[in-house]
């Protein structure tokens, strides 16, 4: 088998063997090495010398195999836009940002650029759980049977109704989607407004 060409090597059809790690240099009609993530081109290739790469300086990065002559500047997550940092910038990766708690991504351009406050879910509902936090605004769904939620909140969860018997009490008023069960001591009389429903 023929030995594999090592950059720089001639390419008549303007394509290179390894598209990820090599690029076509039209001036010399050769394939040259790209620089790995975290580095940039400090000296361009020639017919007799391959690309020379150097590590990105502090506060700069290149995420991919590249033939860039500079590194990209690290940018902080902008708190004014509702973003917070989850991992810092390194030479191989831009700063990783996400929406702050209680916010969702309202503007997306390759990455989230602007977050807004999540909408409140009214009493009797809760926010549908999403696969990824901060991806979209709340979609409020009714509490399932036997559960309640009594606030207007972006994050409150429906809670199970109290079971009076578990506390040695009896039910004075049933729970609804917006309120918990009301319990009372079994020896206490019913409140006046409910006395009409009692069997004599």
């Amino acid at each position: 088998s023929q030995p594999q060409a090592v950059p720089p090597y001639a390419s008549e059809n303007q394509t290179c063997r390894d598209q990820e790690k090599e690029y076509y240099e039209p001036q010399h009609r050769i394939c040259c090495s790209r620089c790995p993530p975290g580095t940039y081109v400090s000296a361009k290739c020639s017919r007799i010398r391959d690309t020379v790469c150097a590590t990105c300086a502090e506060n700069s990065y290149n995420e991919h195999w590249n033939y860039l002559t500079i590194c990209q500047l690290c940018r902080p997550c902008d708190p004014v836009m509702g973003l917070e940092e989850i991992a810092p910038c390194t030479s191989k990766r831009k700063t990783q940002c996400r929406c702050q708690p209680g916010m969702f991504c309202a503007a997306w351009a390759l990455e989230c650029t602007h977050c807004e406050l999540l909408s409140d879910c009214p009493p009797g509902t809760e926010a549908e759980l999403k696969d990824e936090v901060g991806k979209g605004n709340n979609h409020c769904v009714p509490c399932k049977a036997g559960h309640f939620q009594n606030t207007s909140s972006p994050s409150a969860r429906c809670q199970p109704h109290t079971r009076c018997e578990n506390q040695g009490l009896v039910e004075a008023a049933p729970g609804t989607a917006q309120s918990d069960t009301t319990c009372k001591n079994p020896l206490e009389p019913l409140p006046p407004e409910m006395s009409g429903t009692m069997l004599m």
Partner: antibody, heavy 121, light 107 residues
């Protein structure tokens, strides 16, 4: 030859101090993120501290925060770890490790041989 | 903090065996996962960086895969010099954390 050489380890009493040094050669130290990693006898690896290439970003493990200080001198190709208020649980082999291709923390592709720190009364 | 759980903690294998070690992160770390080999009384050596990239000078029988939370180190055909302890490490964020290690012993 690419290498890191640690020094400064030894026996110290609880509450005492030590200063570890790491001399780098054979690579561009001034563009490399550097770390201290330790290994207690018979245990696994534990990250201690990291410093970015120009020293702007510094991180510590919770277990050493407020007691240890990492620093570097790029003119001398040297990394340091000042260890104060030492405890018995700081007893370990301390390794200097570098990420030659990242100014920040990353995979450590170069390691020193380690220096032993023993904290005992 | 990101916890790294490595399994198994030890294994016995013979020369020529295919060996697989797994590492799980407590949250997504993208592909910021590194594998090291350490022999008794020696410093660790980097084998794999960025989950699947082979460090220069490391034999091609070592390979890494995975992204997100689940990662694997594979030794395709074990050689006598591969009996050692292997550690995974995340470099996604500080505190940088290591797995507990996997000791590969001779059967």
């Amino acid at each position: 030859e690419v290498q890191l050489v640690e020094s400064g380890g030894g026996l110290v009493k609880p509450g005492g101090s030590l200063r570890l040094s790491c001399a780098a050669s054979g690579f561009t130290f001034s563009t490399s993120g550097m770390n201290w990693v330790r290994q207690a006898p018979g245990k696994g690896l534990e990250w201690v501290s990291s410093v970015s290439s120009s020293g702007s970003y510094i991180y510590y493990a919770d277990s050493v925060k407020g007691r240890f200080t990492i620093s570097r001198d790029n003119a001398k190709n040297s990394l340091y770890l000042q260890m104060n208020s030492l405890r018995a649980e700081d007893t370990a082999v301390y390794y200097c490790a570098g990420a030659r291709y990242n100014w920040h923390f990353d995979a450590s592709d170069i390691w020193g041989q380690g220096t032993v720190v023993t904290v005992s009364s | 903090d990101i916890q790294m759980t490595q399994s198994p903690s030890s294994l016995s294998a013979s020369v020529g065996d295919r060996v697989t070690i797994t590492c799980r992160a407590s949250q997504s770390i993208s592909s910021d996962l590194n594998w090291y080999q350490q022999k008794p009384g020696k410093a660790p050596n980097l084998l794999i960086y960025a989950a699947s990239s082979l460090h220069s000078g490391v034999p091609s029988r070592f390979s890494g895969s995975g992204s997100g939370t689940d990662f694997t180190l594979t030794i395709s055909s074990l050689l006598p010099e591969d009996f050692a302890t292997y550690y995974c490490q995340q470099s996604y964020n500080t505190p940088l954390t290591f797995g507990g290690g996997t000791k590969v012993e001779i059967k």
